[in-house]
């Protein structure tokens, strides 16, 4: 920052919360789309471009006016592998957090103009180009179809698709959220012969309903319904098949061939949850058992002579937890050599953090490649002489990404290819590689303003700067932007990441309020060194606030003895370390320990509100947006994979103990804002009632604000804008701030 | 590279049974059906039934009782089986792969002569 | 079973010319129609696939078009290697069926 170390000194304006909600500094992406292991597009001005990555050289792939006369509104386009097509989206229709329906047309860049023919349905759940040529699959009314030539008629692959019961290709609600983080339930073969699917059946699933307000000319409310499975519910089933593309015939149904669970998954209830390509006929499956400590791998062969797929037993691969369940949020997904008779994967090692093994297809041990009290965040690539990853390793920061190369032929070769690019500016890294990986984007977001640049992986040479927010960093300049302080503190001779985000001019003499930005779900990370223009920034700037996030136990890359800590347990461990970290806060010396505050959205809100109601005398006041209330109410996958069951037998005394509900008593000790959703598919408007109700039954006078209509994100323009205005007003009135 | 080749045929008795094979090369009668059409001296191309890559059989009517169609998918061969053989079913032989709603490849053709 | 009639059942044409073969299905197939060419000496080829679509090697001066009933073939310059007898064929529905044929011949 120019100007002075002295704040009435400074003229400059703040970052303000209208700053904030209008979006008034803008950070510039970069955002670019591989079509080989050499070229990329990139939008400018509407204009399609088409880059050479070795020379920067770029042409114009499709002009803005191309699409003048078409009518639409173009959401979205995705161009064939092959080049020859482009697949327009249009008529996007939100649904869940990655579902949507749409409605698309092709349009032949050969001949330069749409194909009118057998075109693709309205309403369209999913579509995927093959990954070689231009044939399409897609999904509408849960039923899955194939075009082999985008002007030819659709294959139709499956016919049980129901709505809210059999699902084909594509995700229920619960395998949406919890399980893919996707909408699709298709995999197609690296050349596009086989079309893999699996298929959910709903039919016993238990239905959320809700009233959907609408507009106000709306008599009667609208009822949503949808398959959602709470803790302890009945579960949807899961079938997993492959059809052969090249077999589709307009006057034959198409024959799906099923892969079934392994026998130890068919025992009882079981997830299907990853599904790779290994070969042209390989096929990795991995699934997981209903109570999550324990997963199999299995590695299927497409056989020729009776066209069947054949798992073999002795090339299973079982994954289990001692300490907790499998994999961050699921068993992570395997990256198959070339021949596909082997392929690396991250798993806990012997000391609990998570490293690369490489793993051969006919042998049940494997060989970790890396090591040390760090973790490995991601795979990258893999070519036949490197695997390239993304670890926390550099300087023991867990809150740092760097790219990583490992020699295959020596696993001793290891080489940090971001970590001294530009050390001050750039510590969290992510890449996108082209098709071979001769080439990659490296995208830098923090702790400085967001860097992208391309490299080459023949020298990691870097080629050039790509956006460098050069624009955006002037404008900064004459603002009084806050700081980020990143460190650690040791409670139990354990190292317990936070951040701060600190006032402009802040004065470890002085004191200030703080609010605590509090997460803490499992293997969640709050502190790190991402540069962030937040609602943080505002409190920072203009209201002097301090704005600190902790990482306790629970809490993400760190190795499992912190991330199992919490588990069967939650609302515990993870619960008193944000309110021991306030304590240690205010012992800092410049925190003003009458204003402290705390504040969480989801998961973060249900911590926030077992914080408040702990009776700690630590906080004076907080605000949970859309918190978990009561882990019954949640759904089954997420739940039940760090509580078990809600069952006597299982873990049903710690559901019970770890209500908010139970805690309403102490809320008297503070002042409380609870904000939710109405039309809240995924943490249900009922736990914020159930809150409120027990609140009001024991007295508690406390301040609450629905959002009619609006989903778990509270995101529509003017909610968004709503909810951070009254959550300020809240907090100035908590700090008593003018 | 795909083809088909075919064999059998000749010289047929009225009221003998037919046996013709058409084997493949270059991919799997897995994955790709096996029709079989004919062709009477003079005449036009009849179709005459498949074989799916799955197994499964569809016949014309016209044949329905005395045609079989059936496959060794070990030894990549198809074959077609007609009973009762009469004059009428004199013709030249082809089987053909089916792709997608197409026929992409066809054997040679095999002539069959019905005559006492 | 549907009909298809194919038209003309012969034609002579010169070297160069371009010639268009027709056929109509006795019903709508939509666009699932074929066509073939069978050689002199009995060898069949896939010309056309879905009424328009070119088969892999087969040469540009072949073309097809149309829809629901009426469909058509045009050979736009006339070479030697293109006497053969054409044949058209809906896949639309079991049982499949063929055209009549048409024999070109060269003048």
């Known amino acids: 920052n120019k100007g002075t170390d002295d704040a009435t000194a400074d003229s400059r304006k703040t970052y303000t919360l209208t700053d904030y909600l209008k979006n008034t500094y803008r950070l510039k992406l970069y955002s670019l789309r591989w079509i080989s292991d050499h070229e990329y597009l990139y939008k400018q001005e509407n204009n399609i471009l088409v880059f050479n990555a070795e020379y920067g050289n770029s042409s114009v792939f499709l002009e803005n006016s191309t699409f003048d006369e078409f009518g639409h509104s173009i959401n979205d386009y995705s161009i064939s592998p092959d080049g020859q097509f482009i697949l327009l989206e249009y008529n996007y229709v939100k649904q869940w957090r990655h579902s949507y329906t749409a409605s698309y047309d092709i349009y032949d860049l050969n001949k330069r103009q749409l194909i009118t023919e057998e075109r693709i349905p309205n309403n369209t759940q999913w579509v995927t180009w093959s990954p070689v040529g231009h044939k399409l699959a897609y999904v509408w009314n849960n039923d899955i179809y194939v075009k082999i030539e985008p002007n030819l008629p659709s294959y139709r692959i499956t016919w049980t698709g129901k709505e809210d019961i059999i699902y084909n290709g594509i995700t229920d609600w619960v395998y949406e959220e919890e399980v893919f983080s996707a909408y699709s339930a298709l995999w197609w073969s690296p050349n596009g012969t086989f079309l893999a699917y699996a298929q959910f059946n709903d039919t016993e699933v238990p239905l959320i309903e809700y009233s959907f307000y609408s507009d106000e000319s709306l008599q009667y409310p609208k009822t949503v319904r949808v398959p959602y499975p709470k803790a302890g519910a009945v579960n949807p089933t899961v079938k997993f098949f492959v059809v052969n593309t090249d077999s589709l015939s307009s006057v034959t149904n198409a024959t799906s061939i099923q892969i079934t669970a392994p026998a130890s998954m068919l025992i009882g209830d079981h997830y299907l949850c990853d599904v790779t390509w290994a070969t042209q006929e390989r096929i990795s499956l991995q699934w997981l058992r209903r109570i999550q400590n324990y997963s199999v791998m299995d590695i299927c062969d497409y056989d020729e002579s009776s066209g069947r797929w054949n798992c073999l037993v002795a090339r299973q691969h079982i994954e289990m937890s001692t300490t907790g369940w499998v994999g961050r949020f699921r068993p992570s997904e395997p990256h198959f050599t070339l021949d596909g008779n082997s392929f690396y994967k991250i798993i806990s090692n012997e000391e609990g953090y998570r490293h690369i093994c490489y793993f051969q297809i006919d042998k049940k041990d494997c060989t970790f490649i890396t090591k040390g009290t760090w973790e490995v965040i991601g795979i990258e690539a893999l070519t036949s002489d490197y695997l390239y990853y993304i670890s926390n390793e550099y300087k023991g920061m867990p809150g740092g990404r760097n790219l990583y190369k490992i020699q295959l032929s020596d696993y001793t070769k290891v080489t940090c290819l971001s970590c001294e690019l530009n050390p001050e500016r750039c510590q969290y890294y992510s890449v996108s590689f082209s098709k071979e990986a001769k080439y990659y984007q490296l995208r830098c977001s923090g702790p400085g303003l967001p860097l992208y640049t391309l490299h080459s992986s023949v020298n990691d040479k870097g080629l050039r700067v790509l956006e460098d927010n050069s624009a955006l960093d002037k404008m900064l300049q004459n603002v009084q932007m806050p700081s980020k302080k990143l460190d650690f503190i040791i409670l139990n001779e354990t190292k317990f990441w936070y951040q701060m985000i600190l006032p402009p001019h802040f004065d470890k003499s002085k004191k200030y309020p703080l609010l605590l930005d509090v997460y803490a779900g499992p293997c969640s990370q709050k502190a790190d060194t991402v540069f962030r223009l937040n609602w943080a920034t505002y409190l920072a700037s203009t209201e002097n606030i301090i704005v600190a996030s902790f990482d306790g136990r629970g809490s993400g890359y760190q190795g499992d003895k912190i991330m199992h800590a919490i588990n069967r347990r939650l609302g515990t461990f993870e619960v008193e370390d944000q309110i021991e970290a306030a304590r240690q806060f205010s012992k800092m010396g410049f925190v003003d320990n009458k204003r402290i505050a705390i504040w969480g959205w989801s998961y973060g809100g249900y911590v926030t509100s077992m914080v408040l109601g702990s009776g700690s005398g630590v906080f004076k006041c907080g605000i949970a947006v859309a918190p978990v209330s009561r882990w019954e109410y949640y759904d089954s996958v997420y739940t039940e994979r760090y509580m078990g069951l809600p069952t006597p037998e299982d873990n049903l005394d710690h559901y019970r103990n770890s209500t908010v509900m139970s805690r309403a008593e102490n809320f008297k000790q503070v002042e409380y804002l609870l904000i939710h959703g109405t039309a809240d598919d995924n943490v249900h408007f009922q736990q914020s009632a159930q809150i409120s109700k027990a609140l009001v039954d024991v007295g508690v006078d406390f301040q609450a604000m629905w959002y009619t209509d609006e989903d778990h994100g509270i995101a529509s323009s003017t909610a968004h804008q709503h909810i951070y205005t009254h959550m300020s007003h809240f907090i100035k009135q908590c700090f008593s701030l003018p | 590279e795909v083809q088909l080749v075919q064999s059998g045929g000749g010289l047929k008795q009225p009221g003998e049974t037919l046996r013709l094979s058409c084997t493949a090369s270059?991919?799997?009668?897995?994955?790709?059906?096996v029709h079989w059409v004919r062709q009477a001296p003079g005449k036009g191309l009849e179709w005459m039934g498949v074989?799916?890559?799955?197994?499964?059989?569809d016949y014309d009517s016209s044949f329905m009782s005395r045609v079989t169609i059936s496959k060794d998918t070990s030894k990549s061969t198809a074959y077609l089986q007609l009973n009762s053989l009469r004059a009428e079913d004199t013709a030249v032989y082809y089987c053909t792969r089916n792709r997608h709603d197409w026929f992409d490849y066809w054997g040679q053709g095999t002539t069959v002569t019905v005559s006492s | 079973d549907i009909q298809m009639t194919q038209s003309p059942s012969s034609l002579s044409a010169s070297l160069g010319d371009r010639v268009t073969i027709t056929c109509s299905a006795s019903q709508g197939i939509r666009n699932s129609l074929n066509w073939y060419q069978q050689k002199p000496d009995g060898a069949v080829k896939l010309l056309i696939y879905y009424s328009s679509n070119l088969h892999s090697g087969v040469p540009s001066r072949f073309s097809g078009s149309g829809s629901g009933t009426d469909f058509s073939l045009t050979i736009s310059n006339l070479e030697p290697e293109d006497i053969a007898t054409y044949y058209c064929?809906?896949?639309?529905?079991?049982?499949?069926?063929f055209g009549s044929g048409t024999k070109l011949e060269i003048k």
């Open positions: 074989i799916w890559g799955d197994g499964r059989t």
């Open positions: 064929q809906q896949s639309i529905k079991l049982p499949f069926t």
């Open positions: 270059g991919y799997s009668l897995t994955t790709y059906g």
